[in-house]
């Protein structure tokens, strides 16, 4: 029986009965917030073999092992994850072992096992046999392994029953509990699963099977399940659903899920039955079950009940995220804010059409309107008094409307009004008239030539770069010395630069009047020698990175014909040289035979150029005789090993309080002070733990149902 669409068992342990007939949970399984310690021994769900999303256990008092509850849970598919995790075991106060001895595969996602004070048998499980990549697993804050003394079956009797694998250079027995080994398939099966008797399953099986080489005997399917058979792809007229099974069109048409209730129903796209058309596609008609590609960004119509939407904060802008057509009027009134330009672009950057008017007033935080980076049409179906559909009043720091070289904006109906925008040049407004097709609509007083641009350098000359030199982390540039009509007006230059992967940045990107600016700024004094060209060395740059650079002349606010003269350069794009890449990440090695090592790694976080190949070096090490000196199977005689990393147990410090130079050969020594990098890593780790815990609490604490 398939159970779904996600099962949440909380408060009352008897709700576990809901799992009685489930073989597959299509969705997640939450077992949480059961504060009264119960006896779970009478609860056993041997039918449950697959969870298609994730398993979350949180604060279940009295539960000591999962093995009795779910003895046959074989696969957690991770089709949807809980904060990147397919298995989360968090704050399980009484859990002593995981015990999921039939768990063979976590198809997607990692595991997070944290703050389980009594939990052992963690180091005896080889998660690499279950997951593709173990590097994202997070196993922290559980019972210290030293206090566990985990012993696999038969070890005490010196008749070990479990198989060995290598984890972190430690070759050891692998088990789930004191009497359950971790199952491993013969190497002859390769990536295939196997039966309890070690016979290889059909290639389409995942986890296990009841008979060898039979696609109808799989416990779970590697790809898709249809009519009792595991298939590599869904047959004709059936569609992939929830990442694991094939359904017909009728099933897909009839789905009414809590998650999709507001939508127009599920769609069939690219052989899959899904909740919505994927990114870049739209329904082929409002009630269609099929998707077609969007031309440009997919339309999303947003409507304001009160006709006029006031944007006075990031929060109000957030409501417009993803909107491409706004039915109504926009009133923008941003007086202050942090990182406002990029936040507004994030939430309003997709708007293409406004059906009413756009009014920008008292928005002293704005330097540019480029955050409306896709606005192409103002219909002006509703207009302000005086028939204005674009109204810009009293914006003390507004310097740019849009980059008119790369912008097509049409105002279909209505006039424009501009007043009291002291840094907005009238030439910029006139340019907008031409582009938008409103030229001739405005009357004389609609664009005030005296109080717009009165405090801006509106007649700009162009500065030209004369030379550029690059190294791996430096750029040297020089430019022509600017000579204003009166040389005393020139004070200095300001160089603006930033990383620019693409050649599409503008001067006003990410800039607002409250100090946020995506550009780095450096002041450059005039060279005392009038014949020397000004220049600068930009250092501390990243290797093999493209930067955008431009220069502005800083001039006295000399007014000439009512306007200030100024000068600035075009934006120059320049790439630093390549350099040595950082080290490859997550290097793991394991032996799969007596004469082979398998080494895996992830690419470096900073390639610093185009990677062409890796060099792998290895050398033989002498065997550590220390390993043979003790009987590790004897539970009481595990020696405390002295690691050569400078850290020791507190007990040992009290015995021998002498301090030695770190790294010395003379015995115990103090821990070396943490490096800045280590401190930073610890800080990030603590932050990450908090973020996860907040996510957990926000996800699971919900209002009580009626």
């Amino acid at each position: 029986e398939i159970c779904g669409p996600g099962i949440d068992i909380r408060n009352d342990y008897q709700q576990l009965k809901r799992l009685e007939n489930c073989t597959v949970i299509e969705g997640y399984l939450h077992i949480l917030l059961i504060s009264k310690a119960e006896d779970y021994r009478s609860y056993r769900f041997p039918k449950l073999t697959v969870i298609t999303e994730y398993l979350l256990l949180f604060r279940v008092a009295g539960l000591e092992s999962l093995g009795d509850l779910f003895p046959n849970l074989t696969v957690i598919r991770g089709w949807k994850l809980f904060y990147n995790y397919a298995l989360v075991i968090f704050e399980m106060t009484n859990l002593k072992d995981i015990g999921l001895y039939n768990l063979r595969n976590i198809t997607r996602g990692a595991i997070r096992i944290e703050k389980n004070a009594d939990l052992c048998y963690l180091s005896t499980v080889d998660w690499s046999l279950i997951l593709d990549a173990v590097s994202n697993n997070y196993i922290v804050g559980n019972k210290p392994p030293k206090e566990c003394g985990d012993l696999c079956p038969g070890t005490m009797e010196e008749k070990p029953m479990c198989e060995k694998t290598t984890i972190n250079n430690e070759y050891n027995y692998r088990c789930w509990t004191t009497n359950r080994c971790q199952k491993m398939c013969p190497s002859t099966c390769g990536k295939r699963a196997c039966t309890e008797n070690n016979e290889c399953c059909h290639p389409e099986c995942l986890g296990s099977c009841s008979a060898p080489d039979n696609d109808t005997a799989c416990v779970a399917c590697r790809h898709y399940y249809y009519a009792g058979v595991c298939v590599p792809a869904c047959p004709p007229n059936t569609y992939r659903f929830e990442g694991w099974r094939c359904v017909d069109r009728d099933f897909c048409a009839n789905i009414l899920s809590a998650e999709s209730s507001d939508s127009e129903g599920f769609v069939i796209h690219d052989g899959e039955c899904m909740q919505e058309c994927p990114s870049g596609f739209i329904r082929n008609g409002s009630q269609s079950m099929y998707c077609i590609p969007c031309e440009g960004p997919c339309p999303k119509v947003c409507e304001e009940e009160k006709k006029t939407k006031t944007i006075d904060s990031v929060t109000s802008a957030q409501m417009l995220q993803g909107c491409t057509i706004f039915k109504g009027n926009l009133l923008i009134n941003i007086r202050r804010g942090n990182n406002i330009a990029s936040e507004l672009e994030n939430f309003m950057g997709l708007i293409e059409v406004v059906t009413g008017y756009v009014k920008i007033r008292h928005s002293h935080a704005l330097v540019s309107l480029s955050f409306l980076k896709n606005l192409r049409l103002i219909l002006g179906e509703e207009q302000l008094e005086g028939n204005y559909s674009f109204y810009v009043l009293d914006n003390q720091n507004l310097q740019q409307l849009w980059d008119w070289d790369h912008r097509n904006l049409t105002i279909k109906a209505g006039k424009m009004y501009f007043a009291f925008n002291p840094k907005l040049c009238v030439s910029e407004i006139y340019r907008m008239e031409e582009v938008t097709g409103t030229k001739g609509r405005q009357s004389k007083g609609d664009i005030n030539t005296r109080n717009n641009g009165e405090r801006a350098s509106c007649e700009s000359d162009v500065l030209h770069f004369t030379s550029t030199t690059t190294s791996k982390n430096r750029i040297i540039i020089t430019w022509h010395r600017y000579r204003p009509p009166d040389y005393r007006d020139l004070i200095s230059f300001t160089v603006y630069y930033k990383e620019a992967p693409f050649k599409n940045v503008t001067e006003y990107d990410g800039q607002d009047a409250c100090g946020s600016n995506s550009w780095n700024m450096v002041d450059v004094d005039l060279p005392p020698n009038k014949d020397v060209e000004p220049g600068i060395l930009l250092h501390g740059l990243k290797p093999w990175t493209q930067y955008a650079v431009y220069v502005k002349a800083v001039t006295l606010t000399m007014v000439e014909n009512d306007h200030i003269r100024g000068a600035k350069s075009e934006i120059l794009y320049i790439r630093t040289n390549a350099s040595v890449p950082s080290i490859p990440l997550d290097v793991l090695s394991a032996s799969n035979s007596s004469s082979q090592l398998i080494v895996k790694w992830n690419p470096p976080s900073l390639p610093n150029g185009n990677l062409s190949y890796y060099i792998v070096r290895w050398q033989r090490q002498p065997q550590d005789g220390y390993l043979y000196r003790h009987n590790y199977c004897s539970k009481d005689k595990i020696p405390i090993r002295k690691y050569a990393d400078g850290t020791i147990d507190i007990e040992e410090v009290t015995e021998n309080p002498k301090t030695e130079v770190c790294g010395g050969e003379k015995g115990p020594c103090c821990a070396c002070p943490k490096t800045e990098a280590e401190k930073q890593a610890e800080k990030e780790e603590a932050e990450y733990r908090k973020v996860f815990e907040n996510f957990l609490h926000n996800s699971i604490f919900v209002p009580r149902p009626e």
Epitope: G4, C22, I255, L256, S257, A258, S286
Partner: antibody, heavy 117, light 112 residues
Framework: QVQLQESGPGLVKPSETLSLTCTVS?????????WNWIRQPPGKGLEWIGY???????NYKPSLKDRVTISRDTSKNQFSLKLSSVTAADTAVYYC??????????WGQGTLVTVSS | DIVMTQSPLSLPVTPGEPASISCRSH???????????LQWYLQKPGQSPQLLIY???NRLYGVPDRFSGSGSGTDFTLKISRVEAEDVGVYYC?????????FGQGTKVEIK
């Protein structure tokens, strides 16, 4: 894989309240769909009574609205029908059924309720 | 309530012959979203109803192609191109476009 099972007394006295429960297995009633009651008097046609939705809102047949209540117990994954002031005309086979976005896809096997003194 | 009227109420048929059932509503059952939620169900003796056709003309996966649905607005028809013995039972039309949902009175199909 989704199963619905009606349960309740087979005999109810006139003027009393008829109470039936539908136990759902294989799907959480809060996860989606509309959970309906439909009845069929002996030898007659089907009559839709009403539903409770996955988020707990109700819709009833107007002519029964004053007498009918459909509620749910999410912890047991059950929904219930209560029909008050019953008469012989309420004698019928009562079905619970799941309705999706378009149609009824799963039905219980039905339970006969007789109203008689 | 929208009343769904079926005709005939009884339909004796010969195996291999075609059959047709009509269902009329006294007002349009087109939903505001443009869809017409008109279904046809078959109830075999002693069983719960089972779906045959949804949204006027969509045959449910697994239903034999001798069944077809058609119509629009207020007039709808279920056709069986060649009746087989297993097709006996009561056929109901049902509308789910507007609450309250309603069934037709049913058409009993039996073999002559």
């Amino acid at each position: 894989q989704v199963q619905l099972q009606e349960s309740g007394p087979g005999l109810v006295k006139p003027s009393e309240t008829l109470s039936l429960t539908c136990t759902v297995s294989g799907y959480s009633i809060t996860g989606g769909y509309l959970w309906n009651w439909i009845r069929q008097p002996p030898g007659k046609g089907l009559e839709w009574i009403g539903y409770i939705s996955y988020h707990g809102t109700n819709n009833y047949k107007p002519s029964l609205k004053d007498r009918v209540t459909i509620s749910r117990d999410t912890s047991k994954n059950q929904f219930s029908l209560k029909l008050s002031s019953v008469t012989a005309a309420d004698t019928a086979v009562y079905y619970c059924a799941r309705h999706g976005r378009v149609f009824f896809d799963y039905w219980g096997q039905g339970t006969l309720v007789t109203v008689s003194s | 309530d929208i009343v769904m009227t079926q005709s005939p109420l009884s339909l004796p048929v010969t195996p291999g012959e075609p059959a047709s059932i009509s269902c009329r509503s006294h007002q349009s059952i087109v939903h505001s979203n443009g869809n017409t939620y008109l279904q046809w169900y078959l109830q075999k003796p002693g069983q719960s109803p089972q779906l045959l056709i949804y949204k006027v003309s969509n045959r449910l996966y697994g239903v034999p192609d001798r069944f077809s649905g058609s119509g629009s607005g207020t007039d709808f028809t279920l056709k069986i191109s060649r009746v087989e013995a297993e097709d006996v039972g009561v056929y109901y039309c049902f509308h789910g476009s507007h609450v309250p949902w309603t069934f037709g009175q049913g058409t009993k199909v039996e073999i002559k």
